[in-house]
């Protein structure tokens, strides 16, 4: 457990930019939590560099990260989940840079899954449903979800809808008829815990019905 690098130490190492970012995932593997860190500069020579977390841990002073190609990773039950930990980039016993981080403020949820869209002919709408592993978790249970959809031909014209449930209704009249749509969803912590958006779920593709000329309504596919 060593402090910050002193001036004059580490010679050339001090000239490099060792800034890094981290995210935590709670109960990602049963009751195990994970912490993932990576350098912001992809060109940093990571050969002799290690990451260490100290403080706000259960019955240990510090834990060392495992290196997995370009990222550094810990999986453990030993996070207190309160207060700030000291996360340091180290070469040997010397700390090159350190950050104090509260792991409850850098939570990245797991991506939602099982996204599907069902057309309801009688209601003239589409019911979007998806699942999240967080419904079963003890900690990060309350999430805000961001459902994004677009007409497949409109590459960057995404429409976003924020919701706290895992079900959304899209009105048929708000969508173009006889069009192919792509839809996806991601999540972010929304109560007590803070952090980042999850990865996007796999996209789901669906086609809107044609308009029925006599009634002005869309035909089911």
């Amino acid at each position: 457990e060593s402090g910050y690098a002193q001036n004059g130490d580490l010679e050339d190492a001090e000239l490099d930019d060792y800034s890094f970012s981290c995210y935590s995932q709670l109960e990602v593997n049963g009751s195990q939590h994970s912490l993932t860190c990576a350098f912001e500069d992809p060109d940093v020579n990571i050969t002799n560099l290690e990451f260490e977390i100290c403080g706000a841990l259960v019955e240990v002073k510090c834990l060392n990260f495992r290196k997995l190609q370009e990222i550094y990773f810990i999986e453990t039950k030993k996070f207190l989940l309160i207060g700030k930990s000291n996360i340091c980039v180290k070469v040997g016993e010397k700390s090159l840079t350190c950050k104090k981080i509260d792991l409850t403020t850098i939570v990245k949820p797991e991506a939602p899954f099982d996204l599907s869209v069902v057309y309801r002919e009688g209601a003239n709408d589409f019911v979007v449903t998806f699942n999240t592993s967080h419904l079963q978790k003890k900690y990060v249970k309350v999430l805000m979800h961001d459902v994004a959809y677009r007409q497949e031909k409109d590459e960057n014209k995404w429409t976003h809808v924020n919701l706290s449930s895992t079900k959304l209704t899209l009105l048929q009249r708000k969508l173009q008829p006889a069009a192919m749509y792509e839809i996806k969803v991601r999540s972010i912590p929304d109560h007590y815990f803070k952090g980042f958006w999850s990865e996007w779920s796999p996209s789901y593709y669906f086609r809107t019905p044609e308009i029925n000329n006599s009634s002005g309504e869309m035909d089911p596919i």
């Epitope: 402090g3 240990v60 207190l80 309160i82 207060g83 000291n86 007590y192």
Partner: antibody, heavy 119, light 105 residues
């Protein structure tokens, strides 16, 4: 005003067990760890353990594992320390102390509970 | 487990005198805290994270150090400073030093 109010002094026989309470007021109880510290002979301070009131996660000094058990009642903002199988070595003043999670020092202390173990 | 050794164990200082109390760690410590305790009362946070003064602590107090050597300094001793001072490491298992008793000469 942030305060930690501890239960009163105790005189106990060897082999007995007892529970000290520490009622917190004036702050968000679940936002800080609650720590327990033993002071023997008016001098030596020893950290016993802590509890995160938000989730009940505990961390103990190895020396006090099996001797002390930490719990909380969130509804009443009260922390408890149970001391088991008391001996004369457990005679001491016991403090609860709020842990500042930014710097990991004990920023607010209770007045202490004197425990005397004697036959 | 880190051992914190405070020196001197007891010291006496005249009013107005500069006082330095040291805390030596058996291995490197990132941050050190200091507490003041007067007879019959609970410890009070005095200096945290090496050099930050706790609320209400007079500016004649200062803290410094790194690695295995830390110190608390009083620039000019006053009567109310007579007390026992404890150092404490910031991390598990939050070990305290044995204390330095500061008296008035």
């Amino acid at each position: 005003e942030v305060q930690l109010q501890q239960s009163g002094p105790e005189l106990l026989k060897p082999g007995a067990s007892m529970k000290i309470s520490c009622k917190a007021s004036g702050y968000s109880f679940t936002g800080y760890t609650m720590n327990w510290v033993k002071q023997s002979h008016g001098k030596n301070l020893e950290w016993i353990g802590l509890i995160n009131p938000y989730n009940g996660v505990t961390s103990y000094n190895q020396k006090f594992k099996g001797k002390a058990t930490l719990t909380v009642a969130k509804s009443s903002s009260t922390a408890y320390m149970e001391l088991l199988s008391l001996t004369s070595e457990d005679s001491a003043v016991y403090y609860c102390a709020r842990g500042d999670g930014n710097y990991w020092y004990f920023d607010v202390w209770g007045a202490g509970t004197t425990v005397t173990v004697s036959s | 487990e880190i051992v914190l050794t405070q020196s001197p164990a007891i010291t006496a200082a005249s009013l107005g005198q500069k006082v330095t109390i040291t805390c030596s760690a058996s291995s490197s410590v990132t941050y050190m805290h200091w507490y003041q305790q007067k007879s019959g009362t609970s410890p009070k946070p005095w200096i945290y994270e090496i050099s930050k003064l706790a609320s209400g602590v007079p500016v004649r107090f200062s803290g410094s150090g790194s690695g295995t050597s830390y110190s608390l300094t009083i620039s000019s001793m006053e009567a109310e400073d007579a007390a026992i001072y404890y150092c404490q490491e910031w991390n598990y298992p939050y070990t305290f030093g044995g204390g330095t008793k500061l008296e008035i000469k």
